[in-house]
């Protein structure tokens, strides 16, 4: 019949009726034999005796040399087949066999679930010799058993290269339920159903699961593990956990937070990194994502000008990096800039608006009526022009840039001159005779250099030639330049 020696009365015996060869215990010692404590090698040798072969799990000796009698088959004695105990308890079990003294080199090894237990296990083999046989008792002890000690243990004995195998001793370590799957944090859409899973195992089985939501039980009667909780939907954040119960007591999973997805918070700290005449580089710090990843952002730009129509320019950009270069802006203008970002639920409110300005632009038109003529007596070229009609956004005129290119056989040389904003004429020295001089002029502001005028060419003859006729561009603009010699 089942032997039960428990550390405390448990509600339900694991086996309802007698179970031969089984032992439920929390302090198991199967034999009151002297034993040595401490780590011992798993293998010990018996006194040397003549050996005999064997077949299968039983060694069947042949007739002795005298031919007078047969020896009984060799087999391990039956022992307890099933030991049930609680985690952290100590256990000791053993195999015993009587070996006729004619055998030599007997070794006993312990195996668990098909693998030999080598090294520092608490395995002790003791020998009790008699006239004809030696009783061998191999004991195996485990201190503070863990679930990993569960399994089937056997003894193997080698006699002259033959092997005898004991019946298995099954160790069942029982403890509190152990979670193999716990609920996981989730971000869910408001009022949308979702599932949570909880799974725990023994032994002992069964394991039953209770669900807890915000410190209140969801199910007052448990479900068998594994359990899937279907939550029909939430309107606000909740914390879920599960309790697992078995005959050893209860354990509690980690608590997980289930968040409700919402629109993001507005971005903060919109900053200006760089301004040019027609672009502004901004960055921002994203707001809270509302438990749903950002998809994209929108940069909103309003011109701050009493005369503007107050329309908003919208630039869509990816949510990362949190930076955007706003282009196609007017020079020397003031803008109000805000950023909004979206997730799967919707758009955030717009960030606090910030003011930003573009810088002066370069002039957009070239100087007009560019005229060039040769002053031979002074060996220079006179250049005249009219100030261009620049817009306010181009900023204040700071001067002009004159490009003159000298070309003759085998030579081409470009020179640049800068003149002040008050000038509308300039003189440049003749660089090369018997050459063509091509002149272009651009207006310059703090915002940069504007477009060059159309080229005006003048031929510089060799010394002694006289030519007072000017070359010019017509006032309105971009007709082909005329070269007058």
């Amino acid at each position: 019949a089942i032997t039960e020696a428990r550390e405390e009365a448990k509600p339900y015996p694991l086996f309802p009726g007698p179970l031969p060869g089984s032992l439920q215990t929390d302090h198991t010692s199967l034999l009151s034999l002297p034993h040595t404590s401490g780590y011992q090698p798993a293998l010990m040798f018996s006194p040397t005796q003549p050996g005999r072969p064997y077949t299968g799990n039983v060694a069947i000796p042949r007739v002795t040399s005298a031919g007078s009698k047969l020896l009984p088959p060799l087999a391990f004695k039956h022992t307890v087949g099933h030991i049930i105990l609680s985690e952290h308890k100590d256990v000791k079990f053993n195999c015993s066999i009587s070996v006729p003294n004619i055998y030599q080199d007997t070794t006993i090894s312990w195996w668990k679930d098909g693998k030999e237990l080598l090294g520092a296990h608490h395995a002790i083999t003791q020998f009790y010799p008699d006239d004809e046989v030696t009783a061998i008792i191999a004991s195996f002890s485990i201190t503070s058993v863990q679930r990993s000690d569960n399994g089937s243990y056997i003894c193997k004995m080698k006699i002259n290269n033959e092997e005898i195998v004991s019946d298995p001793i099954y160790i069942e370590v029982q403890g509190l339920p152990h979670f193999t799957k716990q609920p996981e944090s989730m971000n869910v859409t408001r009022n949308t159903a979702f599932n949570l899973t909880c799974q725990a195992v023994g032994p002992p089985e069964p394991v039953n699961i209770f669900w807890v939501q915000n410190s209140s039980r969801v199910n007052e009667q448990p479900e068998k593990s594994p359990s899937v909780l279907t939550v029909p939907g939430l309107t606000e954040m909740a914390v879920f956990s599960c309790e697992a119960h078995n005959d050893k007591g209860l354990t509690v999973s980690k608590g997980v937070q289930i968040n409700i997805k919402a629109i993001p918070s507005p971005p903060t700290e919109v900053s200006i990194h760089n301004s040019t005449a027609h672009s502004i580089l901004i960055s921002w710090v994203p707001g809270f994502d509302g438990y749903s990843p950002f998809r994209n952002c929108s940069v909103q730009v309003k011109e701050v000008d009493p005369l503007s129509n107050g329309s908003v320019m919208i630039f869509n950009t990816s949510a990362s990096p949190h930076m955007y270069q706003i282009k196609q802006l007017q020079a020397l203008a003031n803008y109000s800039i805000g950023v909004s970002c979206m997730n799967e639920i919707g758009w955030s409110a717009v960030s606090p608006w910030i003011l930003a300005s573009t810088t002066e632009g370069a002039p957009s038109v070239a100087p007009l009526n560019v005229t060039v003529f040769l002053n031979e007596s002074r060996d220079n070229v006179d250049i005249r022009w009219m100030k261009p009609l620049t817009k306010r956004q181009a900023g204040e005129l700071v001067g002009y840039r004159i490009s003159h290119v000298w070309q003759s056989a085998g030579i081409s040389k470009e020179l640049l001159e800068e003149v002040g904003q008050n000038n509308s004429r300039a003189q440049i020295s003749v660089q090369v005779h018997n050459a063509t001089c091509t002149v272009r002029i651009a207006a310059v502001t703090k915002g940069g250099v504007g477009p060059f005028s159309d080229p005006v060419k003048i031929f510089i003859p060799a010394h002694g030639w006289v030519d007072h006729a000017p070359s010019s561009t017509p006032a309105p603009g971009n007709a082909d330049p005329v070269l007058i010699i």
Partner: antibody
């Protein structure tokens, strides 16, 4: 051996509060729950609810929601039952019982000796 | 709530004679997995209750085998084959299939 030892008898006036303790020894307190059961004079047993000794999550039977609160001090392996706004009909013996859900269902395997609470003006 | 009704209220018995207590529930105590969570408690005079039986007929450890339980669905019986002096007390059935757990009113076993 598991033992549940409850605090001594209490005599209280109506409207007062009382806190009954139940100290556990001989087991790991947080691996079980604790149920509370009421037995009014000459009456049968009434299950009041239970508390998970690990998480502190409590469940109350409908008749015991509101004025009755279960609590724990795990550092001293003790469960508590607090009753506020006491009424004459709260006069009873209150038992704690170790509780969890095993293969045979709810367990009630060890009981305290009971605490008599008398409410009288 | 499930109402548990015990009868008789009082049961005078002769030592060595059998005794039988009936317990009826207002709803079936068979759960969805085929288990019936019907339990019995014993409360000796001046003592706390003690577990006697669970799952209708399974004896708790240390309970003598003169006690037995039977029944299914809504009708259950606790039997004592030969009453001994130590069996005197109140016996309660209680159910754990439905929430909340509920007790019968108790049956007082006394010696004639």
């Amino acid at each position: 051996q598991v033992q549940l030892v409850q605090s001594g008898s209490e005599l209280k006036k109506p409207g007062a509060s009382v806190k009954v303790s139940c100290k556990a020894s001989g087991n790991t307190f947080t691996t079980y729950g604790m149920s509370w059961v009421r037995q009014a004079p000459g009456q049968g047993l009434e299950w009041m609810g239970w508390i998970n000794n690990y998480s502190g999550v409590s469940t109350y039977a409908d008749d015991f929601k509101g004025r009755f609160v279960f609590s724990l001090d795990t550092s001293v392996s003790t469960a508590y039952l607090q009753i506020s706004s006491l009424k004459a009909e709260d006069t009873a013996v209150y038992y704690c019982a170790r509780d969890y859900y095993g293969s045979g269902g709810w367990v009630f395997d060890y009981w305290g000796q009971g605490t008599t609470v008398t409410v009288s003006s | 709530d499930v109402v548990m009704t015990q009868s008789p209220l009082s049961l005078p018995v002769t030592l060595g004679q059998p005794a039988s207590i009936s317990c009826k529930s207002s709803q079936s105590l068979l759960d969805s997995e085929g288990k019936t969570y019907l339990n019995w408690l014993q409360q000796r005079p001046g003592q706390s209750p003690r577990r006697l039986m669970y799952l209708v007929s399974k004896l708790d450890s240390g309970v003598p085998d003169r006690f037995s339980g039977s029944g299914s669905g809504t009708d259950f019986t606790l039997k004592i084959s030969r009453v001994e002096a130590e069996d005197v007390g109140v016996y309660y059935c209680w159910q754990g299939t439905h929430f909340p757990r509920t007790f019968g009113g108790g049956t007082k076993v006394e010696i004639k």
